[in-house]
Interface confidence: low
Protein backbone atom coordinates (compact mmCIF):
# COMPACT_ATOMS: atom_id res chain seq x y z
CA UNK A 1 0.00 0.00 0.00
CA UNK A 2 1.52 3.12 -0.78
CA UNK A 3 0.77 5.82 1.55
CA UNK A 4 2.88 9.07 0.42
CA UNK A 5 1.67 12.15 -1.24
CA UNK A 6 3.24 14.09 -3.49
CA UNK A 7 2.97 17.54 -3.25
CA UNK A 8 4.45 20.18 -6.01
CA UNK A 9 4.36 23.88 -6.93
CA UNK A 10 1.39 23.47 -8.72
CA UNK A 11 0.58 26.09 -11.55
CA UNK A 12 3.72 28.51 -11.96
CA UNK A 13 3.84 31.46 -14.44
CA UNK A 14 7.49 33.28 -14.47
CA UNK A 15 9.14 35.84 -16.55
CA UNK A 16 10.60 34.74 -19.85
CA UNK A 17 14.49 35.63 -19.77
CA UNK A 18 14.15 34.85 -15.55
CA UNK A 19 14.32 32.00 -13.57
CA UNK A 20 11.85 29.01 -12.16
CA UNK A 21 11.97 26.81 -9.43
CA UNK A 22 10.23 23.45 -9.69
CA UNK A 23 9.63 21.67 -6.32
CA UNK A 24 8.15 17.90 -5.35
CA UNK A 25 7.90 16.81 -1.80
CA UNK A 26 7.08 13.38 -0.76
CA UNK A 27 5.48 13.32 2.45
CA UNK A 28 3.08 10.87 4.75
CA UNK A 29 5.50 8.01 4.13
CA UNK A 30 9.18 6.48 5.44
CA UNK A 31 9.76 5.01 2.15
CA UNK A 32 13.02 5.81 1.41
CA UNK A 33 13.61 8.24 -2.05
CA UNK A 34 16.72 6.06 -4.23
CA UNK A 35 15.90 8.87 -7.14
CA UNK A 36 14.35 11.38 -8.94
CA UNK A 37 13.83 11.59 -12.04
CA UNK A 38 12.64 15.13 -13.74
CA UNK A 39 11.35 15.21 -17.17
CA UNK A 40 9.59 17.72 -19.05
CA UNK A 41 6.03 18.01 -21.31
CA UNK A 42 7.37 15.83 -24.36
CA UNK A 43 8.83 13.02 -21.92
CA UNK A 44 12.14 14.25 -22.42
CA UNK A 45 14.53 13.54 -19.30
CA UNK A 46 15.72 17.04 -17.86
CA UNK A 47 17.53 15.79 -14.59
CA UNK A 48 18.33 12.34 -12.19
CA UNK A 49 19.09 12.86 -8.58
CA UNK A 50 20.27 9.52 -7.71
CA UNK A 51 20.54 8.63 -3.65
CA UNK A 52 23.89 7.39 -4.01
CA UNK A 53 25.30 8.66 -7.10
CA UNK A 54 24.15 12.15 -6.81
CA UNK A 55 22.97 14.65 -9.98
CA UNK A 56 23.23 14.01 -13.62
CA UNK A 57 21.96 16.55 -15.69
CA UNK A 58 21.13 15.53 -19.52
CA UNK A 59 23.10 17.46 -22.19
CA UNK A 60 20.44 19.10 -23.53
CA UNK A 61 19.66 20.81 -20.37
CA UNK A 62 23.00 21.40 -19.23
CA UNK A 63 23.35 25.63 -19.99
CA UNK A 64 19.70 26.08 -18.34
CA UNK A 65 19.18 23.96 -15.69
CA UNK A 66 20.52 23.99 -12.17
CA UNK A 67 20.38 21.12 -9.48
CA UNK A 68 18.57 22.01 -6.46
CA UNK A 69 17.05 22.98 -4.06
CA UNK A 70 17.11 20.24 -2.15
CA UNK A 71 15.77 17.60 -4.70
CA UNK A 72 13.91 20.28 -6.72
CA UNK A 73 15.41 21.93 -10.24
CA UNK A 74 15.80 25.07 -10.93
CA UNK A 75 15.12 26.39 -15.05
CA UNK A 76 16.96 29.63 -16.07
CA UNK A 77 17.17 32.08 -19.27
CA UNK A 78 13.59 30.72 -19.87
CA UNK A 79 11.86 31.15 -23.11
CA UNK A 80 8.23 30.59 -24.13
CA UNK A 81 8.63 27.06 -25.08
CA UNK A 82 9.69 26.06 -22.05
CA UNK A 83 5.74 26.47 -21.42
CA UNK A 84 4.15 23.70 -21.03
CA UNK A 85 3.69 20.72 -18.14
CA UNK A 86 7.20 19.20 -15.61
CA UNK A 87 6.85 15.92 -14.11
CA UNK A 88 8.95 14.85 -10.97
CA UNK A 89 9.52 10.88 -10.09
CA UNK A 90 10.14 9.68 -7.18
CA UNK A 91 11.56 6.06 -7.24
CA UNK A 92 11.32 5.05 -3.61
CA UNK A 93 11.49 1.62 -1.31
CA UNK A 94 9.99 0.12 -0.67
CA UNK A 95 6.32 1.70 -1.90
CA UNK A 96 7.46 2.19 -5.45
CA UNK A 97 6.61 5.41 -7.38
CA UNK A 98 5.34 8.45 -6.63
CA UNK A 99 4.64 11.21 -9.81
CA UNK A 100 3.96 14.56 -9.49
CA UNK A 101 2.99 17.29 -12.63
CA UNK A 102 3.67 20.85 -11.92
CA UNK A 103 2.26 23.26 -15.60
CA UNK A 104 4.76 26.18 -16.09
CA UNK A 105 3.80 29.42 -17.94
CA UNK A 106 6.00 31.21 -19.26
CA UNK A 107 4.88 34.88 -19.84
CA UNK A 108 6.18 37.71 -21.68
CA UNK A 109 8.68 39.94 -19.19
CA UNK A 110 5.31 43.00 -19.25
CA UNK A 111 3.11 40.44 -18.10
CA UNK A 112 4.56 38.13 -15.47
CA UNK A 113 4.20 38.05 -11.82
CA UNK A 114 6.24 35.04 -10.22
CA UNK A 115 4.05 33.04 -8.60
CA UNK A 116 3.99 29.47 -6.96
CA UNK A 117 2.32 27.81 -4.20
CA UNK A 118 2.56 24.43 -2.94
CA UNK A 119 -0.95 21.88 -3.69
CA UNK A 120 -1.08 18.47 -3.10
CA UNK A 121 -2.30 17.22 -6.84
CA UNK B 1 32.90 7.08 5.66
CA UNK B 2 29.11 7.06 6.94
CA UNK B 3 29.47 7.33 10.51
CA UNK B 4 26.45 8.10 13.12
CA UNK B 5 27.62 9.06 16.77
CA UNK B 6 25.32 9.07 19.61
CA UNK B 7 25.61 10.60 22.88
CA UNK B 8 26.40 9.18 25.91
CA UNK B 9 24.49 6.98 28.72
CA UNK B 10 21.28 8.77 30.33
CA UNK B 11 20.62 7.92 33.95
CA UNK B 12 17.22 9.65 34.86
CA UNK B 13 14.52 9.61 37.20
CA UNK B 14 10.89 8.38 36.79
CA UNK B 15 8.45 10.79 35.59
CA UNK B 16 11.53 12.77 33.65
CA UNK B 17 12.31 13.32 29.86
CA UNK B 18 15.39 12.88 28.02
CA UNK B 19 17.29 13.99 24.36
CA UNK B 20 19.02 11.58 22.84
CA UNK B 21 20.95 12.84 19.47
CA UNK B 22 22.55 11.20 16.56
CA UNK B 23 25.01 12.96 14.49
CA UNK B 24 25.56 12.27 11.08
CA UNK B 25 29.03 12.59 8.81
CA UNK B 26 30.38 10.94 5.48
CA UNK B 27 26.70 11.45 3.73
CA UNK B 28 24.25 13.74 2.15
CA UNK B 29 22.41 14.20 5.56
CA UNK B 30 18.97 15.16 4.03
CA UNK B 31 18.65 12.28 1.76
CA UNK B 32 18.30 9.89 4.14
CA UNK B 33 15.58 9.37 6.39
CA UNK B 34 16.63 8.72 10.29
CA UNK B 35 14.93 5.70 11.98
CA UNK B 36 15.34 4.95 16.00
CA UNK B 37 14.89 1.36 17.30
CA UNK B 38 14.84 0.32 20.94
CA UNK B 39 16.09 -2.60 22.41
CA UNK B 40 15.41 -3.46 26.08
CA UNK B 41 18.21 -5.62 27.78
CA UNK B 42 18.03 -9.07 26.92
CA UNK B 43 14.91 -8.13 24.46
CA UNK B 44 14.77 -8.11 20.58
CA UNK B 45 15.06 -4.81 18.76
CA UNK B 46 11.92 -2.70 18.12
CA UNK B 47 11.53 0.18 15.68
CA UNK B 48 10.24 3.54 17.18
CA UNK B 49 9.52 5.88 14.28
CA UNK B 50 11.28 7.72 11.61
CA UNK B 51 12.66 11.30 10.91
CA UNK B 52 13.00 12.91 7.27
CA UNK B 53 16.11 14.89 7.32
CA UNK B 54 14.80 17.15 4.61
CA UNK B 55 11.65 18.15 5.88
CA UNK B 56 11.29 17.13 9.29
CA UNK B 57 8.03 14.70 8.63
CA UNK B 58 7.75 11.84 11.09
CA UNK B 59 6.14 8.85 11.42
CA UNK B 60 5.79 6.52 15.06
CA UNK B 61 4.91 2.84 15.56
CA UNK B 62 1.78 2.83 17.29
CA UNK B 63 3.26 1.61 20.70
CA UNK B 64 5.90 5.38 20.51
CA UNK B 65 3.49 7.15 19.74
CA UNK B 66 2.65 8.87 22.92
CA UNK B 67 6.31 8.55 24.33
CA UNK B 68 8.49 10.14 21.52
CA UNK B 69 9.09 12.69 19.44
CA UNK B 70 11.65 12.79 16.65
CA UNK B 71 13.35 16.08 15.53
CA UNK B 72 16.41 16.99 12.95
CA UNK B 73 18.99 19.44 12.71
CA UNK B 74 19.98 20.46 9.43
CA UNK B 75 22.39 22.59 9.85
CA UNK B 76 24.24 20.38 12.51
CA UNK B 77 23.26 16.86 10.46
CA UNK B 78 22.01 15.96 13.88
CA UNK B 79 18.85 13.85 14.56
CA UNK B 80 17.25 14.07 17.95
CA UNK B 81 14.74 11.58 19.89
CA UNK B 82 13.22 12.83 22.83
CA UNK B 83 11.66 10.45 25.37
CA UNK B 84 9.50 11.98 27.88
CA UNK B 85 7.43 10.85 31.63
CA UNK B 86 9.94 7.74 31.07
CA UNK B 87 9.80 4.44 33.70
CA UNK B 88 11.69 1.63 34.24
CA UNK B 89 9.88 -0.12 31.11
CA UNK B 90 12.04 2.45 29.34
CA UNK B 91 15.24 1.64 30.28
CA UNK B 92 17.01 0.01 27.52
CA UNK B 93 19.84 0.66 24.80
CA UNK B 94 18.19 3.05 21.85
CA UNK B 95 20.29 3.03 17.85
CA UNK B 96 19.55 5.47 15.50
CA UNK B 97 19.84 3.83 12.19
CA UNK B 98 20.35 5.26 8.39
CA UNK B 99 17.39 4.54 5.81
CA UNK B 100 19.09 3.00 2.81
CA UNK B 101 17.36 0.53 -0.13
CA UNK B 102 18.00 -2.65 1.84
CA UNK B 103 17.45 -1.89 5.81
CA UNK B 104 19.33 -0.25 7.73
CA UNK B 105 23.18 -0.41 6.50
CA UNK B 106 24.23 1.46 8.92
CA UNK B 107 23.86 2.34 12.79
CA UNK B 108 24.77 3.98 16.00
CA UNK B 109 26.78 2.88 18.64
CA UNK B 110 23.69 3.07 20.91
CA UNK B 111 22.59 5.15 24.11
CA UNK B 112 22.27 3.48 27.25
CA UNK B 113 19.17 5.11 29.07
CA UNK B 114 18.70 3.83 32.57
CA UNK B 115 15.53 4.90 34.90
CA UNK B 116 15.89 4.63 38.05
CA UNK B 117 15.01 6.53 41.16
CA UNK C 1 1.21 -4.92 11.91
CA UNK C 2 2.99 -8.02 9.94
CA UNK C 3 4.19 -10.26 12.91
CA UNK C 4 7.25 -11.77 12.29
CA UNK C 5 8.23 -15.41 14.22
CA UNK C 6 11.22 -16.55 14.39
CA UNK C 7 12.43 -20.03 14.95
CA UNK C 8 14.16 -21.18 16.60
CA UNK C 9 14.96 -19.12 19.43
CA UNK C 10 18.10 -20.82 20.51
CA UNK C 11 20.04 -23.07 18.76
CA UNK C 12 23.18 -24.71 18.98
CA UNK C 13 25.77 -25.91 16.25
CA UNK C 14 29.53 -27.52 15.63
CA UNK C 15 32.26 -25.95 13.46
CA UNK C 16 31.84 -27.56 10.06
CA UNK C 17 28.00 -27.86 10.59
CA UNK C 18 25.27 -26.86 8.24
CA UNK C 19 22.76 -24.25 10.10
CA UNK C 20 19.07 -22.93 9.04
CA UNK C 21 17.00 -20.37 10.59
CA UNK C 22 13.92 -19.27 9.87
CA UNK C 23 11.41 -16.16 9.98
CA UNK C 24 7.66 -16.52 9.36
CA UNK C 25 5.76 -13.43 7.92
CA UNK C 26 2.35 -12.86 9.26
CA UNK C 27 1.09 -11.70 5.69
CA UNK C 28 3.52 -10.92 2.26
CA UNK C 29 5.83 -8.49 3.00
CA UNK C 30 8.37 -6.93 0.28
CA UNK C 31 11.99 -7.55 1.36
CA UNK C 32 13.27 -9.47 4.08
CA UNK C 33 16.12 -8.29 6.08
CA UNK C 34 18.91 -9.98 8.33
CA UNK C 35 20.97 -8.83 11.15
CA UNK C 36 23.93 -10.42 12.91
CA UNK C 37 24.31 -8.87 16.53
CA UNK C 38 26.91 -9.97 19.21
CA UNK C 39 26.69 -9.21 22.70
CA UNK C 40 27.41 -5.14 23.43
CA UNK C 41 27.48 -4.34 20.02
CA UNK C 42 25.27 -2.80 17.50
CA UNK C 43 23.62 -4.70 15.10
CA UNK C 44 24.79 -5.21 11.51
CA UNK C 45 23.04 -5.36 8.18
CA UNK C 46 23.90 -9.21 7.23
CA UNK C 47 22.05 -10.47 4.52
CA UNK C 48 19.38 -7.46 2.69
CA UNK C 49 16.26 -7.87 -0.06
CA UNK C 50 16.02 -11.26 1.18
CA UNK C 51 19.20 -12.65 -0.38
CA UNK C 52 22.09 -10.92 -0.78
CA UNK C 53 25.03 -10.40 1.50
CA UNK C 54 26.01 -7.11 3.42
CA UNK C 55 29.38 -5.90 2.43
CA UNK C 56 32.15 -8.27 3.94
CA UNK C 57 29.60 -11.12 4.47
CA UNK C 58 31.13 -14.17 4.00
CA UNK C 59 29.83 -16.01 1.17
CA UNK C 60 28.93 -19.49 3.28
CA UNK C 61 25.67 -17.45 4.47
CA UNK C 62 23.16 -17.16 2.15
CA UNK C 63 19.56 -15.96 2.41
CA UNK C 64 16.13 -17.30 0.60
CA UNK C 65 12.13 -17.47 0.50
CA UNK C 66 9.20 -20.31 0.17
CA UNK C 67 6.01 -18.42 0.16
CA UNK C 68 5.95 -16.16 3.47
CA UNK C 69 8.72 -18.24 5.16
CA UNK C 70 12.64 -16.65 4.96
CA UNK C 71 15.74 -18.65 5.85
CA UNK C 72 18.93 -17.67 6.61
CA UNK C 73 21.58 -20.35 6.11
CA UNK C 74 25.22 -21.15 7.16
CA UNK C 75 27.10 -24.02 4.88
CA UNK C 76 29.56 -24.35 7.42
CA UNK C 77 29.21 -22.75 10.78
CA UNK C 78 32.23 -21.55 12.51
CA UNK C 79 33.33 -20.10 15.75
CA UNK C 80 32.76 -16.27 14.43
CA UNK C 81 29.73 -16.88 13.28
CA UNK C 82 28.24 -17.41 16.93
CA UNK C 83 25.75 -14.19 17.58
CA UNK C 84 21.90 -13.65 17.88
CA UNK C 85 20.36 -12.90 14.44
CA UNK C 86 17.70 -10.59 13.59
CA UNK C 87 14.73 -10.65 10.67
CA UNK C 88 13.35 -7.31 9.76
CA UNK C 89 10.46 -6.30 7.00
CA UNK C 90 9.84 -3.55 5.38
CA UNK C 91 6.40 -3.08 4.02
CA UNK C 92 5.34 0.60 3.09
CA UNK C 93 4.33 2.39 6.53
CA UNK C 94 5.33 -0.77 8.87
CA UNK C 95 8.44 -1.76 10.11
CA UNK C 96 9.12 -4.95 12.34
CA UNK C 97 11.73 -7.20 13.70
CA UNK C 98 11.62 -10.39 14.45
CA UNK C 99 12.16 -11.61 18.00
CA UNK C 100 15.47 -13.00 17.05
CA UNK C 101 17.51 -16.44 16.62
CA UNK C 102 20.91 -17.11 19.18
CA UNK C 103 23.44 -19.08 17.77
CA UNK C 104 26.10 -20.96 20.02
CA UNK C 105 28.99 -23.15 19.36
CA UNK C 106 28.51 -26.39 20.62
Known amino acids: MMTGTIETTGNISAKKGGSVILQCHLSSTMAQVTQVNWEQHDHSLLAIRNAELGWHIYPAFKDRVAPGPGLGLTLQSLTMNDTGEYFCTYHTYPDGTYRGRIFLEVLESSVAEHSARFQIP | EVQLQQSGPELVKPGASVKISCKAS????????MHWVKQSLGKSLEWIGY????????GYSQKFKSKVTLTVDRSSRTAYMDLRSLTSEDSAVFYC??????????WGQGTLVTVSA | QIVLTQSPAIMSASPGEKVTMTCSAS?????MHWYQQKSGTSPKRWIY???KLASGVPARFSGSVSGTSYSLTISSMEAEDAATYYC?????????FGAGTKLELK
Open chain 3, 49 to 51: DTS
Open chain 2, 97 to 106: ARSSRGGFAY
Open chain 3, 27 to 31: SSVSY
Open chain 2, 26 to 33: GYTFTDYN
Open chain 2, 51 to 58: VNSFNGNT
Open chain 3, 88 to 96: QQWSSNSLT
